[in-house]
Interface confidence: low
């Protein structure tokens, strides 16, 4: 069930973990507006997919909403069908 | 400059909880994650568990049962409770701040609250 | 979890001196590996984090190395007041654990 308060990518944190295949895309989306270089760098240094999405979600407690907001619509852009799975969860 | 100050009991008897406040400045809770981990003689340093700047949090499996952390972004506060405890529980209890990038590390510490549980 | 060890649990050194602090994985932590500084009134300071990160403020007698599961913190033209005791971290994997620290005392 969903957690009141919380932004959607911190609710399904787990899941998009275990579940996002498309990492690079949402690099190159989420590159200059919220990830600097460096953090760009780092995640692309990841040997799998889980560890990049584990190591993106290590900057996220930094962001605001509207930052949180950027990183959901590049999942709605790369894999619909998982945000629309978990939206029914 | 960033500072975590932390308050607590300095004695407490066995079976009975602990309540650490950990309150911070120049930061906001609502933009930085605040880890806890505690220095016993026996196990030396320990990580507890952690809240995010979204209100979630994480624990160390050892500890779930046990263990609580809450805050108050509007009062700079951290909340750290810890149920059931037993003299193996002595230690100091520290909360620190999570770094920037780059994994997890901790970045400024708090002073530490001394805990013995004894009767 | 993974198990971290610093081999060395006391090292004597005299002012000026070059120490090295070991730290071993017990498996792959990348360079998620942090160093802190604890001083014997129980205050504790990041000194360096990402293997190699000098955090800010520590002075750029400290450094690190590493990768993997093998790293190690050097300090170098050792001062007074770097005799304390020496704590690595992985920030790799949950549970975050740490070595069992290495006391450096003045020789």
């Known amino acids: 069930a969903a957690k009141p308060g919380l932004h959607f990518i911190d609710q399904h944190r787990a899941a998009l973990i275990a579940r996002v295949t498309n990492v690079e895309w949402l690099l190159d989306a989420l590159y200059g507006k919220v990830l600097t270089d460096e953090q760009y760098q780092a995640v692309r240094a990841e040997p799998t997919n889980p560890s990049k999405m584990r190591k993106l979600f290590s900057f996220t407690p930094a962001w605001n909403w509207t930052c949180k907001d950027l990183l959901l619509q590049a999942l709605r852009e790369s894999q619909s069908y998982l945000v629309e799975d978990l939206e029914r969860s | 400059q960033v500072q975590l100050k932390q308050s607590g009991p300095g004695l407490v008897q066995p079976s009975q909880s602990l309540s650490i406040t950990c309150k911070v400045s120049?930061?906001?809770?609502?933009?930085?994650?605040v880890h806890w981990v505690r220095q016993s003689p026996g196990k030396g340093l320990e990580w507890l568990g952690v809240?995010?700047?979204?209100?979630?949090?994480e624990y160390n499996e050892a500890f779930i049962s046990r263990l609580t952390i809450s805050k108050d972004n509007s009062k700079s506060q951290i909340l750290f409770r810890m149920n059931s405890l037993q003299p193996a529980d002595t230690a100091i209890y520290y909360c620190?701040?999570?770094?920037?990038?780059?994994?997890?590390?901790?970045?400024?510490w708090g002073q530490g609250t001394t805990l013995t549980v004894s009767s | 979890d993974i198990q971290m060890t610093q081999t060395s649990s006391s090292l004597s050194a005299s002012l000026g001196d070059r120490v090295t602090i070991s730290c071993r994985a017990s498996?792959?932590?990348?360079?998620?590996l942090n160093w802190y500084q604890q001083r014997p009134d129980g205050t504790v300071k990041l000194l360096i984090y990402?293997?190699?990160k000098v955090h800010s403020g520590v002075p750029s007698r400290f450094s690190g190395s590493g990768s993997g599961t093998d790293f190690s913190l050097t300090i170098s033209n050792l001062e007074q007041e770097d005799f304390a005791t020496y704590y690595c971290?992985?920030?790799?994997?949950?549970?975050?654990?740490f070595g069992g620290g290495t006391k450096l005392e003045i020789k």
């Open positions: 498996q792959d932590i990348s360079n998620y």
């Open positions: 809240i995010w700047s979204g209100g979630t949090t």
């Open positions: 971290q992985q920030g790799n994997t949950r549970p975050f654990t």
């Open positions: 120049d930061f906001s809770l609502s933009h930085y994650g």
């Open positions: 620190a701040r999570k770094g920037d990038f780059y994994g997890d590390y901790f970045d400024y």
């Open positions: 990402y293997t190699s």
